[in-house]
Amino acid sequence: SIPWNLERITPPRYRADEYQPPDGGSLVEVYLLDTSIQSDHREIEGRVMVTDFENVPEEDGTRFHRQASKCDSHGTHLAGVVSGRDAGVAKGASMRSLRVLNCQGKGTVSGTLIGLEFIRKSQLVQPVGPLVVLLPLAGGYSRVLNAACQRLARAGVVLVTAAGNFRDDACLYSPASAPEVITVGATNAQDQPVTLGTLGTNFGRCVDLFAPGEDIIGASSDCSTCFVSQSGTSQAAAHVAGIAAMMLSAEPELTLAELRQRLIHFSAKDVINEAWFPEDQRVLTPNLVAALPPSTHENLYFQ
Amino acid sequence: GAMGQEDEDGDYEELVLALRSEEDGLAEAPEHGTTATFHRCAKDPWRLPGTYVVVLKEETHLSQSERTARRLQAQAARRGYLTKILHVFHGLLPGFLVKMSGDLLELALKLPHVDYIEEDSSVFAQ
């Protein structure tokens, strides 16, 4: 049966026993800045082009054992959530991956900047259709990272990022705090903000909306047919990147402002239990859970 | 995210160093009274001292970025410091990534075209 997260973002009219807008997002290219990925996993084979871009710090610890499946874990799962054949949101979207996170899931602001610059240069060399950039990472507030995101957004690129998993104000993190970026928090099957160990999803006025981010089934790098459940604001951001890809594929001329407005318009309103957030943040945090547009756009979104 | 917000720095640390008018023998000294600022991550364990993104003013051309980077290296060498230019930015932001001692920050902030310098820091999969 359909995984809970795909059901949650699907308009009621389409909730049959399977989620199948088969060509969703086919006009859009989604860039993923993350770990290395297992691009020939059955769930994503032929959908993800691994670019030659790699800018990662060395792994910490003298005895770190680099294991391919662990190195690829985070990125493979997210690629599957965006465009996977069976558990993906935008099954028609093509992706390009850049490696900016090492085998421990760690990267640098500078490496991310160089990755964003690489995307801009690729866009200039070979202009394609709409571009979505997924940044499933977070660091401390960074003026330069936010500035780079702003420049890329002004060049017509849609950037989607994780709000962060620190149970904290997203405005203290980057790229989550960049105003031009679509920042996504995580909710669970009960529409509760996601708790992750002692921490959880970030919140506050720098978050644009929430999306499913707990127990999300997706491609596992453990084997070429494996699936695994992962949780985090990265998974939530991947859902919104997929939804954005489908919206842009249906209406390629949408501006960032229009896309943001549509994402908000079609979101489920006031379903999140706000008691989870600190009292002073409740009024600032958007009570929105991302969803695809309903059947009025049948011809556009569900060809 | 969330358009329409005012700039929010949080606990973000900003060290402002006013530029001296006497410019260390530079031909192309900045206008008197302008300041370049230094930024670093508020979360200490995430800081990566020794690597810095030197961001230049918006209209700076690639050739000027390269020239500024070379100038920094030359001035650092005169003071007995080794530096390494790791990347020159162009296309999104003008500037360069440099590996150098933090002792050189004051010098770097006084270079022509410099808007601000940010110490590199870590980002993490979420």
């Epitope: 399977e18 199948q20 088969p22 297992q38 691009s39 020939d40 059955r42 084979e45 032929g46 993800v48 082009m49 691994v50 391919a68 054949r85 069976d86 099954k91 084997c223 070429s224 047919t225 | -």
Partner: antibody, heavy 115, light 109 residues
Framework: QVQLVQSGAEVKRPGASVKVSCKAS????????ISWVRQAPGQGLEWMGW????????NYAQKVQGRVTMTTDTSTSTVYMELRSLSSDDTAVYYC????????WGQGTTVTVSS | QSALTQPASVSGSPGQSITISCTGT?????????VSWYQQHPGKPPKLMIY???NRPSGVSIRFSGSKSGNTASLTISGLQAEDEADYFC?????????FGGGTKLTVL
């Protein structure tokens, strides 16, 4: 254009081994693995397994597990399928195909097992 | 014994439409969006005609279409032509592998 080119026909004795090659070109090799499928005379298609060109991981069908080994040589963009302890039941045309989606196929390699 | 069940043969006259069924279980056809259909002429390798239930690769005639309901997938060929005479195989993912149907011989009368 995307192409998979296989090695030539083989005749083998029962108990012997055969190694079939498949050279890939015209696409980003690491974006797809290679599947191997065989077809006995007058019969249907049987999936034998898959190998990752990206990291060499394999996924073998239960029926041939223990007798089959798939390998890759990334320097020549070639994938190999070796089948051991051959019997007359292994007489078939062996195909390589691109990925699990099998959207592009090699021309086939006829393997005859006969005493 | 093939994992997926197809009729051994179907036939139709030129210009007619025919449908070939492919029945599996919830562990294969019913559980995945990845049902494919292949056409195979004698002495030739199979050719992909439909992938992911209903998608056509470029270069494949729009006369070929695919669908799925529950555990059964179907291939429909409209406006039959003489060159459509061939064997047709369906395939599906399973949790760890791939399975094919036994094949259907299409005869154009």
């Amino acid at each position: 254009q995307v192409q998979l080119v296989q090695s030539g026909a083989e005749v083998k004795r029962p108990g012997a081994s055969v190694k079939v090659s498949c050279k890939a070109s015209g696409y980003t090799l690491t974006s797809y693995g290679i599947s191997w499928v065989r077809q006995a005379p007058g019969q249907g298609l049987e999936w034998m397994g898959w190998i990752s060109v990206y990291n060499g991981n394999t996924n073998y069908a239960q029926k041939v597990q223990g007798r089959v080994t798939m390998t890759t040589d990334t320097s020549t963009s070639t994938v190999y399928m070796e089948l051991r302890s051959l019997s007359s039941d292994d007489t078939a045309v062996y195909y390589c195909a691109r990925g699990y989606g099998m959207d592009v196929w090699g021309q086939g390699t006829t393997v005859t097992v006969s005493s | 014994q093939s994992a997926l069940t197809q009729p051994a043969s179907v036939s139709g006259s030129p210009g007619q439409s025919i449908t070939i069924s492919c029945t599996g279980t919830s562990s294969d056809v019913g559980g995945y969006n990845s049902v494919s259909w292949y056409q195979q002429h004698p002495g030739k390798p199979p050719k992909l005609m439909i992938y992911e239930v209903s998608n056509r690769p470029s270069g494949v005639s729009i006369r070929f279409s695919g669908s799925k309901s529950g555990n059964t997938a179907s291939l429909t060929i409209s406006g039959l032509q003489a060159e459509d005479e061939a064997d047709y195989f369906c395939s599906s993912y399973t949790s760890t592998s791939m399975v094919f149907g036994g094949g259907t011989k299409l005869t154009v009368l």
